[in-house]
Amino acid sequence: IWELKKDVYVVELDWYPDAPGEMVVLTCDTPEEDGITWTLDQSSEVLGSGKTLTIQVKEFGDAGQYTCHKGGEVLSHSLLLLHKKEDGIWSTDILKDQKEPKNKTFLRCEAKNYSGRFTCWWLTTISTDLTFSVKSSRGSSDPQGVTCGAATLSAERVRGDNKEYEYSVECQEDSACPAAEESLPIEVMVDAVHKLKYENYTSSFFIRDIIKPDPPKNLQLKPLKNSRQVEVSWEYPDTWSTPHSYFSLTFCVQVQGKSKREKKDRVFTDKTSATVICRKNASISVRAQDRYYSSSWSEWASVPCS
Amino acid sequence: RAVPGGSSPAWTQCQQLSQKLCTLAWSAHPLVGHMDLREEGDEETTNDVPHIQCGDGCDPQGLRDNSQFCLQRIHQGLIFYEKLLGSDIFTGEPSLLPDSPVGQLHASLLGLSQLLQPEGHHWETQQIPSLSPSQPWQRLLLRFKILRSLQAFVAVAARVFAHGAATLSP
């Protein structure tokens, strides 16, 4: 058993049929010694008396808010949550496996630049009685500070018969050094509590590996005289690290119709302009990627050919 | 050329070669990105490699003030990785695929380090750690980790030279 926060405790249980469970001793936070009784949740049934209460925690029915009273007055609470371990593996019932970039990916994180700011998100089908708490650091043995905000519900989607909820959190490294080569990864830890179930999820990454630039901005077309060709120009996204002579991007320019199966023109460039062939009913799209490190491509920025 | 005396390097040549190094480092092991090597005790294994750190003057301001500190750090790293790629970690079993770009990568690391420090000038170099894995699978894992680390190192070096070529070239 360990303390998650004040008056909230996590009991770690090996979860299998007829498991013996864990013996837990609760102590009432009071100077009083006599006349103390214990109850669980909203029940008025007295579970025991005395300053301490010893319980055998085996299942969710044994978890909940234990309250010690004296003469009708509440003295203190202890909330017990369960953390299940099945076949040596901690349960991951609360969050959905996003399976990208690999199986057992519950947290996904992205950074728009090298400033040390990043966003993580996760998915669940649970809509109520759900809380998250996020902590982060650079390195684990001698951790350096990363400050995370509160996790918020950022999207709701319908997937078949189910509703899916996306939560996200923004974090910022306290003393970021955008130009340095990272040697220690960022660690992100998410505590998830659903009703009386506790789970924790972690992710470890370098900012360089989660970089995904915003799409290029201000796409403009200039038809070339006596030619089917069009000069397309664009600018670096505002959110990208500066100076651009140091933090350079490379671009992919593509002309394609509505369907991915249609024929296309495609060219890669380090410049912020390119010459392509425009077709009726097609769009010109441009996306960006770090020039020197193969992290994710941005989403496409598009303009119609016409 | 960057020499201990403090003259400028051939920024444009260094830029071209460092960008080539980036391409080679990724073609040497493109799928490395899909392996979570940190699960294999990454902090201990590759902490010995020289990293370009915050105080090394490789940021745009530091380069403007005095590029020598940064260039010396890059040179140290190039020599270090060049020795690693020539060591039995890469030459031992399991043999590299004949079409592996590691050979080209090795030669390009040497080429860039010589551009930075011509014969007759000597900057301090870092001792190469004795990373001699006994098992072929350990060697394979170490190769992945070294290449992964090299990808990050050459990316910073390429940024330095690109910025230098754009803003510090005579």
């Epitope: 249609e262 023109d265 890669f268 380090d270 010459t275 077709r279 | -």
Partner: antibody, heavy 118, light 107 residues
Framework: QVQLVQSGAEVKKPGASVKVSCKAS????????LHWVRQAPGQGLEWMGW????????EYAPKFQGRVTMTTDTSTSTAYMELRSLRSDDTAVYYC???????????WGQGTMVTVSS | EIVMTQSPATLSVSPGERATLSCRAS??????LHWYQQKPGQAPRLLIY???QSISGIPARFSGSGSGTEFTLTISSLQSEDFAVHYC?????????FGGGTKVEIK
């Protein structure tokens, strides 16, 4: 599978014109760009231009501008390349090729030998 | 127009050995570079597109690398059917241009 079958060899006099055909099969004709590339005997490859069979748009290499015309007949899935004012140095194998991507060449025809000789 | 230069013009290699073919562009072309193989009396066939992307059906012994102005086609272990002329082609800008070719011959 995608296939391109070209017309047979031609012998022409200097100053004449030649029209080479290229019949496509195995795909929707308007879904691919069509290019023409030539190769003089013992020499390298030289790009001449492309046509979009969907709308007849063309782009020719400056060297051939004014002397070459590329056309298509969608009813027969056939592309044509006409080269006028032939000279002896136009002696070459002429290839048509097709691709969904505009700038490189995936599927090639077998080639048509055009000999220009007086 | 962009001029593509291939070297060497002829490469003599023994079967089973590795062949490294070079292609240089007269200006930076990013990764807009493609490789073809042509055997005598046949049309060329595409081996690699966008500098390093492999084509299904092409043996894994063919690999490409490079960006900017310098590119390499590597044939890891030459088989008898690989002895042919290999061309690079840039697609950075029109007109599309080819290198002069490298003939890979049996040593």
């Amino acid at each position: 599978q995608v296939q391109l079958v070209q017309s047979g060899a031609e012998v022409k006099k200097p100053g004449a014109s030649v029209k080479v055909s290229c019949k496509a099969s195995g795909y929707t004709f308007t879904d691919y760009y069509l290019h023409w590339v030539r190769q003089a005997p013992g020499q390298g490859l030289e790009w001449m231009g492309w046509i979009d069979p969907e709308n007849g748009d063309t782009e020719y290499a400056p060297k051939f501008q004014g002397r070459v015309t590329m056309t298509t007949d969608t009813s027969t899935s056939t592309a044509y390349m006409e080269l006028r004012s032939l000279r002896s140095d136009d002696t070459a194998v002429y290839y048509c090729n097709a691709n969904k991507e505009l700038r490189y060449f995936d599927v090639w025809g077998q080639g048509t030998m055009v000999t220009v000789s007086s | 127009e962009i001029v593509m230069t291939q070297s060497p013009a002829t490469l003599s290699v023994s079967p089973g050995e590795r062949a490294t073919l070079s292609c240089r562009a007269s200006q930076s072309i990013s990764i807009n570079l493609h490789w073809y193989q042509q055997k005598p009396g046949q049309a060329p066939r595409l081996l690699i597109y966008f500098a390093s992307q492999s084509i299904s059906g092409i043996p894994a012994r063919f690999s490409g690398s490079g960006s900017g102005t310098e590119f390499t086609l590597t044939i890891s272990s030459l088989q008898s059917e690989d002895f042919a002329v290999h061309y690079c082609q840039q697609s950075n800008s029109f007109p599309l241009t080819f290198g002069g070719g490298t003939k890979v011959e049996i040593k």
